[in-house]
C-alpha cells in the first residue's frame, strides 16, 4: 500500500475548503477538502439533506 | 487533457487598459484559485493577485491595488486580468495560474506591449 | 507582505559541478516552498513544492531542503540542459517570487 505524505493545508489557500477541513497531499501537489457531515462537492460547496422517507401505501 | 488558454497579444498606448482572458478546459474553475503571475522582458516573476472564482472574492498586491481587476466567468469557464493606466514599465508577459486541486499549473502567457 | 531573499542573482558553474541556490523568507513559511526553472520563451516549470517534493519527471539530481525561514536548492551534478534562470516561491501567506538566479556554464 502505497504511503501519502499529507499536511494542513498553507494559509494561501484559507477559505478554500467552505464546509471541511483543508489537506495537502504532498505527493499528489494539491490540496483536498475533507468535507463536514452533509457536504459535498470538491470544496464541500454542496449541502445535501438525505431524507428517509417512510414506505408508501402500496408498499405495506 | 486540463488546459489553460490565454487571449494572444496586445499592444496598447500609455493610459489605455488592457483584459486578458485565461479559458479552462478539462477542468472547473470554481474548483479552483486562479492567480496572475506577471514577467517583465528580462526580468523575474512578479505575482499580482488572485480570484476565488466560486465567490469572486479577490486578493491583490499593495502595489497593483486600484489599477489591477481579477474577476472570473464561471458559466464559460474564464478569469480575466484587467490592468488600466498602461504605462511602459507593464510591458510584461501575463500568465494566468491555477492553484487548489492541482499545484500551480500555467497558461501559456500573454504579451502586452505599452508602447506610444 | 512575505519577502523572498534570493542568492545569489547568478552563478557560473562547470558541468558536473554542485550547484546551490538559497531563499531566506522575512518570516516563518512553514516549509511552503516550491522552485521553478525558466528558459527562455518558455513558461516556468515546477521542479520541487513543499521544500523537498520533487515533481514526476524532474532528474533527481534535483533537491530542496530547509525549514522555518530559510531554504536551499541544488543541482547535485549540472548538465548542460539546466543552464536556466531558477525562482523559488513561498505559497504560506499568498505568493513572493524571489528574484530569479540565473545560471550559466563556464
Known amino acids: 500500500v502505497a504511503q501519502v505524505s499529507i499536511t494542513k493545508c498553507s494559509s494561501d489557500m484559507n477559505g478554500y475548503c467552505l464546509h471541511g477541513q483543508c489537506i495537502y497531499l504532498v505527493d499528489m501537489s494539491q490540496n483536498y477538502c475533507r468535507c463536514e457531515v452533509g457536504y459535498t462537492g470538491v470544496r464541500c460547496e454542496h449541502f445535501f439533506l438525505t431524507v428517509h422517507q417512510p414506505l408508501s401505501k402500496e408498499y405495506v | 487533457q486540463d488546459q489553460l488558454v490565454q487571449s494572444g497579444a496586445e499592444v496598447k498606448k500609455p493610459g489605455a487598459s488592457v483584459k486578458v482572458s485565461c479559458k479552462a478546459s478539462g477542468f472547473n474553475i470554481k474548483d479552483t484559485y486562479i492567480q496572475w503571475v506577471r514577467q517583465a522582458p528580462g526580468q523575474g516573476l512578479e505575482w499580482m493577485g488572485r480570484?476565488?472564482?466560486?465567490?469572486?472574492?479577490?486578493k491583490y498586491v499593495p502595489k497593483f491595488e486600484g489599477r489591477v481587476t481579477i474577476t472570473a466567468d464561471t458559466s464559460t469557464n474564464t478569469a480575466y486580468m484587467e490592468l488600466s493606466s498602461l504605462r511602459s514599465e507593464d510591458t510584461a508577459v501575463y500568465y494566468c495560474?491555477?492553484?487548489?486541486?492541482?499545484?500551480?499549473?500555467w497558461g501559456q502567457g500573454t504579451l502586452v506591449t505599452v508602447s506610444s | 507582505d512575505i519577502q523572498m531573499t534570493q542568492s545569489p542573482s547568478s552563478l557560473s558553474a562547470s558541468v558536473g559541478d554542485r550547484v546551490t541556490i538559497t531563499c531566506k523568507a522575512s518570516?516563518?513559511?512553514?516549509?511552503?516552498i516550491a522552485w521553478y526553472q525558466q528558459k527562455p520563451g518558455q513558461a516556468p516549470r515546477l521542479l520541487i513544492q513543499?521544500?523537498?517534493t520533487l515533481q514526476p519527471g524532474v532528474p533527481s539530481r534535483f533537491s530542496g531542503s530547509g525549514s522555518g525561514t530559510d531554504y536551499t536548492f541544488t543541482i547535485s551534478s549540472l548538465q548542460p540542459e539546466d543552464i536556466a534562470t531558477y525562482y523559488c516561491?513561498?505559497?504560506?501567506?499568498?505568493?513572493?517570487f524571489g528574484g530569479g538566479t540565473k545560471v550559466e556554464i563556464k
Open positions: 480570484i476565488d472564482p466560486l465567490n469572486g472574492n479577490t
Open positions: 516561491l513561498q505559497y504560506d501567506n499568498l505568493r513572493t
Open positions: 495560474v491555477r492553484s487548489g486541486t492541482l499545484f500551480d499549473f
Open positions: 513543499y521544500t523537498s
Open positions: 518570516q516563518d513559511i512553514h516549509k511552503y
